[in-house]
Amino acid sequence: ECVTQLLKDTCFEGGDITTVFTPSAKYCQVVCTYHPRCLLFTFTAESPSEDPTRWFTCVLKDSVTETLPRVNRTAAISGYSFKQCSHQISACNKDIYVDLDMKGINYNSSVAKSAQECQERCTDDVHCHFFTYATRQFPSLEHRNICLLKHTQTGTPTRITKLDKVVSGFSLKSCALSNLACIRDIFPNTVFADSNIDSVMAPDAFVCGRICTHHPGCLFFTFFSQEWPKESQRNLCLLKTSESGLPSTRIKKSKALSGFSLQSCRHSIPVFCHSSFYHDTDFLGEELDIVAAKSHEACQKLCTNAVRCQFFTYTPAQASCNEGKGKCYLKLSSNGSPTKILHGRGGISGYTLRLCKMDNECTTKIKPRIVGGTASVRGEWPWQVTLHTTSPTQRHLCGGSIIGNQWILTAAHCFYGVESPKILRVYSGILNQSEIKEDTSFFGVQEIIIHDQYKMAESGYDIALLKLETTVNYTDSQRPICLPSKGDRNVIYTDCWVTGWGYRKLRDKIQNTLQKAKIPLVTNEECQKRYRGHKITHKMICAGYREGGKDACKGDSGGPLSCKHNEVWHLVGITSWGEGCAQRERPGVYTNVVEYVDWILEKTQAV
């Protein structure tokens, strides 16, 4: 059962796993949620009746029954982890804590103009977990405006104390705001020879990389595969760090793989969700339960629905035994990973999917697409919406993309002459315009947010957000697309598609069925040559065939230029402008979304 509210003046008795320090009960709840075993917590707020050394303690707790006895205690705030909840979870914490000093290892000290600048510095520093900033009112002159970057083994402060005229806060890496490079490559036959901060068992290098990503101290990793010569080290995932933030030495070693934490691209890549099955593989760990199940998929479902289950091993039924049902072993461990991984015993293993809700919804795999053909099929582009105006009559106005459960990203030029958001209707999950009837459900638009530097499409800033009146329930036919990572600026996208209901030639009409076209990206230098009368800025991105023939056209505006990278679709561009449609040597010009990620996050995460 999902319980989100906090219990004031209440303490949970027993079940302690560990104690950490957090600046608020709200953040204690987040820490508990992300901890592999924590189900409940008790936080101690500052209070004259409490010993100051206990202020800001966050005791993480577990219980076989998923609850613990409650005791009245002033200044104690207790609650449950969000593991039991189905809603999306984020570790992003933008709060600034006034008059609190969050203790950790102070590894960098510099002058900053403001707390915001200090927080940005922390976000863009590979080691930084949190910071403390001494304001200009700080009593000690030489410490004024000093920004201290800090880290700890756990990613949370080692202690928190009251200190006048300072502010503290956390890195915003988990808010997708880091400019650090996002290196997705996994290097085969490579060992990074740096200090290990931890080691866990993993079935493959991808899981190892994801574990590294959400481990607070891990910057890169080395994984020894099951063919590694030293038996005791097989399936070992070594989590590593270095002072420089990069591996100091790379050693060529067969059957080892290495890679980097995906911390700065984690909002657009799954890092918690280990959805694969591992055949002929047994995961060892503390046994939670043994239940009969028809298949390994059914076993995974059972594990996902059991809040304490972290991973499982399924042994298929022997012949006609037990009505064809196999045994499903639900398991857990102290760190969420198997204590040992064995091969060749016939088991099928995997992980709970409960943690998938900690990943961005946009990273969910969508159904395989139909290659070739220009008409799309249902569910092929589930982020694509059709934006209708009701003036003068109801009609398709522009395309748009779902980027959040209340947010559509589209082009600013779509709103020329639109005096009110009330006259707009957003339809999602639509393949054919003819499906839209008077009684078809739609999302009303609460607010149109146009970039304040927008003047006309050709001069850039052709980007707008629509805030919907109600939230979108994600399904197979309507779900968000990931924004590109700022760390992905140098990625060369090779699988890009433009979609929309727009014209198929310059003098045409809106198409009934959603059209798709695979279009190659064109460098900005090349694009500039084709548009000598315009300035093609780095905030624009171009796509098109030299010979023309495939392009976006009237009515496609605002829709997505979607590019697939590492199995995840990213919203690389917004259809903006071009000379004619599909003309030779006249590529389509799109708003370069990666350059507006900060703007998008600022507007969509505004309180």
């Epitope: 009701t390 003068p392 009559t393 009330k422 008077e438 809106i510």
Partner: antibody, heavy 117, light 107 residues
């Protein structure tokens, strides 16, 4: 069922003004544009303008911009058209009509305005 | 403003005959054209929307066709109750405009 009720007739003096009403029922008044159309005796239909009751957004034909003012009262689901400085040229039947999903699907019975001294 | 020109201004028909009314737009209005039937002392009634879609309850002898600038309303077999004025109107862009109408009379 959708209904648009208009008073049958209005007799007004030249130079005066009149406020025509159109009471809507049977649908969500705020979610549809209400249009006003003029028909002089023996002539065609002329579009005056429209209003979106949920936001009070309006559009007018330039010809009627200084003549007509459109308003809506969402509490009573009534649309109004105020006509000012009336002359004999304004003598006509005035219809309110709902812009349905794709067209003007429901029409009021029309109010006959006679401008005479 | 988009001008909608209807022809003929009037026509006399016998019951059972096929009638074709024309409406031309001064510029491309895609398919944003409606046809209305208007009888004396009544309010106009919607027959066709989107150039070719028959409105609910309209007999299937009424058919609309055309796109861009040329539109047609066809009555396959005219009935006595079809005697009325017929107006086309465009809702592609503001200001909305109507044709002057075609009067359909009985011979």
């Amino acid at each position: 069922q959708v209904q648009l009720q208009q008073p049958g007739s209005e007799l007004v003096r030249p130079g005066a003004s009149v406020k025509l009403s159109c009471k809507a029922s049977g649908y969500t008044f705020t979610r549809y544009w209400m249009h006003w159309v003029k028909q002089r005796h023996g002539q065609g239909l002329e579009w005056i303008g429209n209003i979106y009751p949920d936001s009070d957004s309006t559009n007018y034909d330039e010809k009627f911009r200084t003549k007509a003012t459109l308003t809506a009262d969402t509490s009573s689901s009534t649309a109004y058209m105020h006509l000012s400085s009336l002359t004999s040229e304004d003598s006509a039947v005035y219809y309110c009509t709902r812009m349905g999903f794709y067209a003007m699907d429901y029409w009021g019975q029309g109010t006959s305005v006679t401008v005479s001294s | 403003n988009i001008v909608m020109t209807q022809s003929p201004k009037s026509m006399s028909m016998s019951v059972g005959e096929r009638v074709t009314l024309s409406c031309k737009a001064s510029e491309n209005v895609v398919t944003y054209v409606s046809w209305f039937q208007h009888k004396p002392e009544q309010s106009p009634k919607l027959l066709i929307y989107g150039a070719s879609n028959r409105y609910t309850g309209v007999p299937d002898r009424f058919t609309g066709s055309g796109s861009a600038t040329d539109f047609t309303l066809t009555i396959s077999s005219v009935q006595a109750e079809d005697l009325a004025d017929y107006h086309c109107g465009q809702s592609y862009s503001y200001p909305l405009t109507f044709g002057a109408g075609t009067k359909l009379e009985l011979k």
